[in-house]
């Protein structure tokens, strides 16, 4: 999937199966990555977990699970807010769209977190103060922890000379992440995809044509679309939301 | 202690949360202060030694002499409040200020810094 | 989550002394009044005391008054009971509660007055 | 001081099985307000007493809702609808209307 992370790095991975995305002392999100088609190096979110860990008179601990084809309302146990204690609505779930958007508010961390359905896989979208970000006990073990550290360099997929390839008359498939490239769906029509609902030609942008080059799946272009959308609502610096391609940092840093 | 189920429905009974009530809202702020104050006077029996009664009290106490409220009056009606859908747990509820992280957070220092990760696509 | 931990519990003779030390954590201390309460070997429980949350006021049972303090020291996080003139009755483990009405306890430590 | 007496003192019951502990007070509980300030703690074999219910009924946070209270003036009483092993103890009441504050007797769970 695609990486925005805390420090406005913004990477296209490879992960696959269970990665943390946050993990600090208070939450811990972990995402499961599948390959989207087979035999592809890319992947997207099939699975999404949450754990809001016990917080003082606030809140007991609650799990959120999605799946593909599974966006609950409600925490594992069936709860909306965070359980018994004075603060419990200090946490609370609001389903925006049923099936396809979810919001979860945790006033107690001043965190907002937006997950969706679209298509097939889910997108995961976070507010949270840095304090609560930077709030780790073991600082050792941040080393995999996506959203701050972003992911590990061997799991970064170059789309940029992905694109490069692509924007080229012949394609050749070894230039692609994905043996299985759909033919069908030409650059020029994953650009003009892509141009509808994303007329800055930022990042999201790019990944929307990347997404489309390597799926054919025209719901990726919704993935790119929400996810600007979603950083429009919880961004607290409006300059920084769109993100243009720089040029390549060194191998060791965090991209 | 059910100090904060006073303290909640004193700010929502004075809508906005302000302590500066315009003019001709003062003999309804003064109701809903007499309501809070015999609120807090209940949970004495088991809130009497935190923090949060005492700051209530004093509070209560504040207010009542800026807004020349009397002792003696109407209290307001607490409002009708829709039920939490079957199945949620609201026992307990009332959000604590430490539940509440950016009014906390506002006592100590500045408005906190606040930064935004995604994923999506492929 | 929080968490109450009682030491300085021991043997001590009757007519003695003992300090019994009440660590908090998991929550903010300084917010809350707190209490002691003993159970007697085989027996059942019996309050001993409350302090409030800025050590404003005390309340003791009169079983104990004059003899024990409860004081607190907030930037510690740390609840203490002073017990003297101690005699066998006060035999027991004594535990220290979070709130002005005792929501969660400590493990407790035992206190055995005996010659 | 107010006096609460529990019975039965000792309560063996069968798994599944619904149990009933009373507590009487030697004097009313209900304040001039109207409220009750009557709790219920457990203590399980070798534990510290951990808080189930508060102000006559109320559950506390994490308690199952098998566990009931209900009740007021003096009379008031502690329900298990289905008792399961864990719920082996003592389980006490407590008043918080009068000073000093004071316990039950305690009443004995043991499985059947």
């Known amino acids: 999937p695609h990486l925005r992370t805390f420090t406005d790095h913004f990477q296209t991975c490879k992960v696959q199966g269970a990665w943390p995305l946050i993990d600090n002392n208070y939450l811990n999100v972990q995402v499961t990555n599948t390959p989207v088609l087979p035999g592809s190096a890319a992947t997207a979110t099939s699975k999404l977990t949450i754990i809001f860990k016990n917080f003082q008179e606030c809140v007991d601990q609650k799990v959120y699970q999605a799946e593909m084809d599974e966006l609950p309302s409600a925490f594992a146990d069936g709860s909306k807010n965070g359980g018994d204690k004075h603060g419990a609505n200090s946490l609370k779930i609001t389903e925006k769209v049923s099936g396809q958007h979810v919001e979860i508010q945790a006033k107690y961390i001043g965190t907002t977190i937006v997950v969706r359905q679209v298509g097939r896989y889910l997108t995961f979208a976070v507010r949270m103060p840095e304090e609560v970000v930077n709030a780790v006990e073991d600082r050792d073990s941040q080393g995999l922890y996506l959203c701050l550290r972003g992911c590990p360099l061997n799991q970064q997929i170059d789309f940029q000379a992905f694109r490069a390839n692509a924007e080229s008359p012949r394609r050749p498939a070894a230039a692609s992440p994905s043996p299985v490239v759909p033919e069908t769906f030409p650059y020029e029509t994953a650009v003009a995809k892509c141009k509808e609902k994303l007329p800055v030609e930022d990042l999201y942008y790019q990944a929307c044509v990347f997404d489309l080059l390597t799926t054919g799946d025209v719901n990726f272009t919704l993935a790119a679309y929400y996810a600007l959308e979603d950083g429009k609502m919880l961004h607290s610096n409006k300059d920084k939301l769109h993100l243009f391609e720089r040029t390549r940092e060194l191998p060791g840093a965090v991209a | 202690c059910k100090i904060l189920k006073c303290n909640s429905e004193f700010w929502s009974a004075t809508s906005s949360g302000s302590h500066a009530p315009a003019s001709d809202d003062v003999p309804e702020f003064c109701a809903a202060l007499r309501t809070y104050a015999l609120c807090t006077r209940r949970t004495a029996r088991t809130c009497r030694g935190d923090l949060a009664y005492h700051s209530a009290v004093h509070g209560i106490e504040d207010l009542m002499s800026q807004h020349n409220c009397s002792k003696d009056g109407p209290t307001s009606q607490p409002r009708v409040r829709t039920l939490p859908p079957a199945g949620d747990s609201q026992e307990r509820s009332d959000s604590p200020e430490i539940c509440h992280y950016e009014k906390s957070f506002h006592k100590h220092s500045a408005a906190p810094n606040y930064t935004h990760c995604g994923l999506f696509g492929d | 989550e929080v968490q109450l931990v009682e030491s300085g519990g021991g043997l001590v003779q009757p007519g003695g002394s003992l300090r019994l030390s009440c660590a908090a954590s998991?929550?903010?201390?300084?917010?809350?009044?707190m209490n002691w309460i003993r159970q007697a070997p085989g027996k059942g429980l019996e309050w001993i005391g409350m302090i409030y949350y800025d050590s404003s006021e005390k309340h003791y049972a009169d079983s104990v008054k004059g003899r024990f303090t409860i004081s607190r020291d907030n930037s510690k996080n740390t609840l203490y009971l002073q017990m003297n003139s101690l005699r066998a009755e006060d035999t027991a483990v004594y535990y220290c509660?979070?709130?002005?009405?005792?929501?969660?306890w400590g493990q407790g430590t035992m206190v055995t007055v005996s010659s | 001081d107010v006096v609460l007496t529990q019975s039965p003192l000792s309560l063996p019951v069968t798994l599944g099985q619904p149990a009933s502990i009373s507590c009487r007070s030697s004097?009313?509980?209900?304040?001039?307000?109207?409220?009750?300030?009557l709790e219920w703690f457990q203590q399980r074999p070798g534990q510290s007493p951990r808080l189930l219910i508060y102000?006559?009924?109320s559950r506390f946070s994490g308690v199952p809702d098998r566990f009931s209270g209900s009740g007021s003036g003096t009379d008031f009483t502690l329900k298990i609808s289905r008792v399961e092993a864990e719920d082996v103890g003592v389980y006490y009441c407590?008043?918080?209307?009068?000073?000093?504050?004071?316990f039950g007797q305690g009443t004995k769970l043991e499985i059947k």
């Open positions: 004097q009313s509980l209900e304040t001039s307000d109207g409220d009750t300030f």
């Open positions: 509660a979070k709130g002005t009405t005792p929501d969660y």
């Open positions: 998991g929550f903010t201390f300084s917010n809350y009044g």
């Open positions: 407590m008043q918080v209307t009068h000073d000093p504050l004071t």
């Open positions: 102000e006559v009924s």
